[in-house]
């Protein structure tokens, strides 16, 4: 417990002390006083530097003093042999004896007692940065006018922080200039502008003067910019050493200028304003930036628009362009969007053909359709190259979007038809020598494939059968080999209006109009033994002249059976009309007169005994087409005959082509169109 | 008649493997994108993954993609599904469909059931 | 992705009866490639209405579908027996994925 005076005592005074002790006082007065230590009496054994016996005064790691030997006062009218003054407010007292003394010592009294100590003056280093003020245990410092003193009750500085500067535009200067700065200060302005808006600081070489830095280089007196985590100096010297134009990047800058004791200068003037903060004019491949600006600021909005063939994809969507903002941290919203080429993805299937894989399905990419050779060909043209586009579809040149359409080859047989003389004059035949025959179970005839969805055949076999069975791609009918063959489920029988129905069709003798389709419910699939016969055209090409020769097939009688269980064909001319008139019907079942013959009939035969007969009805009388040798069209149907074995009836197909494609049309799905 | 046969499914364990197959006839197999599709018991429809007629190019849902990968053998008229590191929530009839114009899938088979419990 | 809704979810209606089967688009979709598909307890399901409008073979007349942009319909003029079945819609965007409607169940009240 810190005490205001003491007394001090060797062991034993004021008789001898013993040898060989070691004693120490701790001396401590209140804070703010300093020591006042004084010996009365000192008897010590002397000896050199006091190395046997002493007294020792230490004052923190400061010996201030070893004493021995005897003293007496030098002033009769003071006790006082030996003195100490320190201004701490701690000592120790240290009392040491050797093993042996030759005489007898009394040792020592010494008194302390707590004194002021002057703080301003008793010190090297200076307390206060302006004005000391002592009293008795203590000291207070004080400033100046205008200054006022720091939390650390030693330093005076001038009141220059705390200011915050929100105008987009305004200008700083130090205290007092031009005059000289406070010494000893620290300032702090804050600029806080609105966000999206930089700080950009400016400042004239002459408006600076600062205590310039010392020979380390390390400025005494600085100017300090601090934006987010950049910073701009420390300066100093006399002229702005550093930029004339700071861009800060920020919407916040503190300035901090820092002062020490010495050297004043005038200080430091600058203006500062607000700019929008910039953003980069970054580069966006595959695009275009509108509008285009040499320098994009806060608030600037761009339109980004991908060259064709590239996209930006966002959530699986993709869109030719996006928005792009500036934003006050000085980035682009958006930024993690990129123009990319468009895929087109995988390309669509098409019905009997194919399309090869590409390498990509990017933008440019080349893909070519093709159809199922040689059963089918590309109806539509465009010569099935298609390119990856722009808008994400596949392209043609000629169609666009279109996809190719692979329509049937029509009236091409895979093995053409060699006479073998056999049938009713006719010959064996193989159904890939007629891939159009199709086969009618009840009533037992035929009948004309014409395309995927159509059958063609006389209106006379369908009459009394509006859902017949049909079959395709067998040369025999069989049972058994019906079971393989494929089967066709008719839809919709359409009967040609012109065509009179009677109570009793036995009794027949008109069979102008005899024509019908047989709409499919599913298309067929075309291949060597099953394929479409072509329908005539419309030109004078294919008018029938007399001798030019057709071809007949079917599975009717012959002479020696009433149904034949193989394909059978014939080659027979075209006869005159009249050749028909003039045959006697076999089994008449009317007048002679009563049998209606008219220009939709073509009469065909007489050679050889070639005829169709009953059970070839509806199928095609196949005639070689005028303007294309390597197909066949269906000039007629099997239709009636007076007399099996010499001329037979056929519907002349040409005068029902409008009907035929009319009906079609009418009656198709959309997969036809 | 265009037929789509599915096999290859059963029960399996989370983090399990299995692998699925189509075997397709009566069409060109090889002239046709095919797609596998799934339905969770009592759920809806979900589209799975898509490849192109050669094989080069395939698309698989983001949840499963990395997991399972399709695949084809045009000569033996099979597409596949290998799946990987199967969980519980992958549970569901697995379909094959062909893909036909304007990628409608015009023929599906009748699917094959994958079970993911422990 | 595309997410499509399809309302309701259940359709109680008579044979006889006129339905009506939503489907919406959560973004605009090309008609072409918006189909439509039917399926029964326990089979698979059948292409029913490609295209928007198109029906598939074997798909009775009295079905039609329209629609365009994200609002697609499939109606049937005079329910049949026969039609009672949950029905889909789908589409395809080439930069996938494939997204289906979590279907209509058409049943008889």
């Known amino acids: 417990e810190p005490t205001m005076y003491g007394e001090i005592l060797s062991p034993n005074y004021p008789q001898a002390y013993p040898s060989e002790v070691e004693k120490s006082w701790d001396i401590e007065v209140p804070e703010g006083y300093g020591i006042h230590l004084y010996f009365t009496h000192l008897d010590i054994e002397l000896s050199e530097n006091c190395a046997y016996d002493s007294v020792q005064i230490i004052s923190g790691d400061t010996e201030e003093g070893r004493l021995c030997g005897q003293r007496s006062s030098n002033n009769p009218h003071s006790p006082i042999v030996e003195e100490f003054q320190v201004p701490y407010n701690k000592l120790q007292v240290i009392f040491k004896s050797d093993f042996s003394n030759e005489e007898r010592f009394t040792g020592f009294a010494a008194y302390y007692v707590a004194t002021d100590i002057n703080e301003c003056t008793d010190f090297v280093d200076v307390p206060c940065s302006h004005f000391c003020n002592n009293f008795i245990g203590g000291y207070f410092c004080s400033c100046p006018p205008e200054y006022f003193l720091h939390d650390d009750m030693k330093n005076c500085g001038v009141n220059c922080s705390g200011d915050v500067f929100t105008a987009l535009i305004g200008e700083i200067a130090s205290p007092n200039y031009p005059k000289p700065y406070p010494e000893n200060s620290r300032c702090e302005y804050q600029i806080r502008l609105e966000k999206g808006f930089q700080v950009v600081v400016t400042l004239r070489r002459e408006d600076f003067d600062v205590e310039a830095a010392d020979s380390a280089g390390n400025c005494l007196d600085s100017l300090v910019f601090v934006a987010g985590d950049r910073q701009f100096g420390p300066y100093c010297g006399h002229g702005f050493p550093g930029p004339l134009n700071i861009e800060t990047k920020s919407n916040a800058l503190d300035i901090i200028f820092q002062t020490d004791l010495t050297g004043q200068k005038k200080g430091w003037k600058l203006r500062y304003h607000g700019d929008p903060m910039p953003c980069p004019k970054e580069d966006t491949p595959n695009s275009v930036w509108e509008p285009a600006k040499a320098k994009y600021v806060f608030r600037d909005v761009v339109q980004i628009t991908c060259l064709d063939g590239f996209e930006v994809v966002e959530g699986r969507v993709g869109a030719t362009s996006f928005y792009s903002t500036c934003q006050s941290n000085g980035k682009w919203s958006n930024s993690k969007l990129k123009c990319q080429p468009v895929d087109c993805g995988i390309p669509e299937s098409i019905e009997n053909g194919k399309v090869e894989d590409p390498e990509s399905t990017l933008f440019g990419s080349v893909i070519r359709y093709t159809c199922e050779e040689p059963y089918y060909y590309m109806e539509n043209g465009g010569g099935g190259e298609y390119h990856c586009a722009g808008n994400g579809s596949w392209v043609n040149e000629v169609l666009g979007p279109e996809l190719p359409k692979c329509v049937p080859v029509c009236g091409v047989p895979r093995e053409p038809f060699e006479e073998k003389q056999r049938i009713i004059g006719g010959s064996d035949a193989d159904i890939k020598n007629f891939p159009w025959q199709v086969f009618f179970d009840n009533p037992w005839a035929g009948g004309a494939l014409i395309n995927e969805y159509w059958v063609l055949t006389a209106a006379h076999v369908v009459e009394g059968n509006r859902e017949p069975t049909m079959y395709v791609g067998s040369t025999s009918v069989q049972t058994s080999r019906l079971a393989k063959s494929k089967m066709l489920t008719p839809e919709h029988v359409f009967i040609h209006p012109g065509w009179k129905l009677l109570e009793v069709p036995e009794g027949r003798t008109n069979f102008d109009n005899d024509i019908a389709l047989v709409r499919l419910k599913d298309p067929v699939k075309m291949g060597p033994t099953v394929s479409p016969i072509c329908l005539p055209g419309t030109s004078s090409d294919y008018n029938l002249m007399d001798g030019d020769l057709g071809l007949i097939s079917g599975w009717g009688r012959t002479e020696k059976r009433d149904r034949a269980v193989r394909l059978k064909a014939a080659r027979l001319p075209v006869a005159p009309l009249r050749k028909c008139k003039e045959v006697k019907v076999e089994k008449p079942t009317a007048d002679a007169e009563a049998y209606v013959f008219t220009p939709n009939m073509i009469c065909a035969g007489g050679e050889k005994g070639m005829d169709s007969c009953k059970g070839d009805s509806g199928g095609a009388f196949a005639v070689q087409d005028p303007n294309d040798k390597t197909k066949f069209y269906a000039a007629g149907l099997v239709s009636w005959g007076p007399q099996c074995g010499t001329y037979g009836l056929y519907t002349r197909v040409k005068n029902y082509v409008d009907w035929i494609m009319k009906t079609m049309q009418e009656n198709s799905t959309p997969r036809e169109d | 008649e265009v037929m789509l046969v599915e096999s290859g499914g059963g029960l399996v364990k989370p983090g399990g493997s299995l692998r699925l197959s189509c075997a397709a006839s009566?069409?060109?197999?090889?002239?046709?994108?095919m797609s596998w599709v799934r339905q969770a018991p009592g759920k809806g429809l979900e589209w799975v993954a898509t490849i192109s007629s050669g094989g080069s190019h395939t698309y698989e849902l983001d949840s499963v993609d990395g997991r399972f990968t399709i695949s084809r053998d045009n000569s033996k008229d099979t597409l596949y599904l290998q799946m990987n590191s199967l969980r519980a929530e992958d549970t569901a009839l697995y379909y094959c469909?062909?893909?036909?114009?304007?990628?409608?899938?015009?023929?599906w088979g009748q699917g094959t059931l994958v079970t993911v419990s422990s | 992705q595309i997410v499509l809704t399809q309302s309701p979810a259940t359709l109680s209606l008579s044979p006889g009866e006129r339905a009506t089967l939503s489907c919406t688009a959560s973004s605009e979709v090309s008609s072409s490639y918006l189909h439509w598909y039917q399926q029964k307890p326990g089979k698979a399901p059948k292409l029913w209405i490609y295209s928007t409008s198109n029906l598939a073979s074997g798909v009775p007349s009295r079905f039609s579908g329209s629609g365009s942009g994200t609002d697609y319909t499939l109606t049937i003029s005079s329910l049949q027996p026969e039609d009672f079945a949950t029905y889909y819609c789908?589409?395809?965007?080439?930069?996938?994925?494939?997204?289906f409607g979590q279907g209509t169940k058409l049943e008889i009240k």
């Open positions: 469909a062909r893909l036909f114009t304007k990628h409608a899938m015009d023929y």
């Open positions: 789908h589409q395809y965007y080439r930069l996938h994925p494939i997204t």
């Open positions: 009566g069409f060109e197999f090889e002239n046709y994108a």
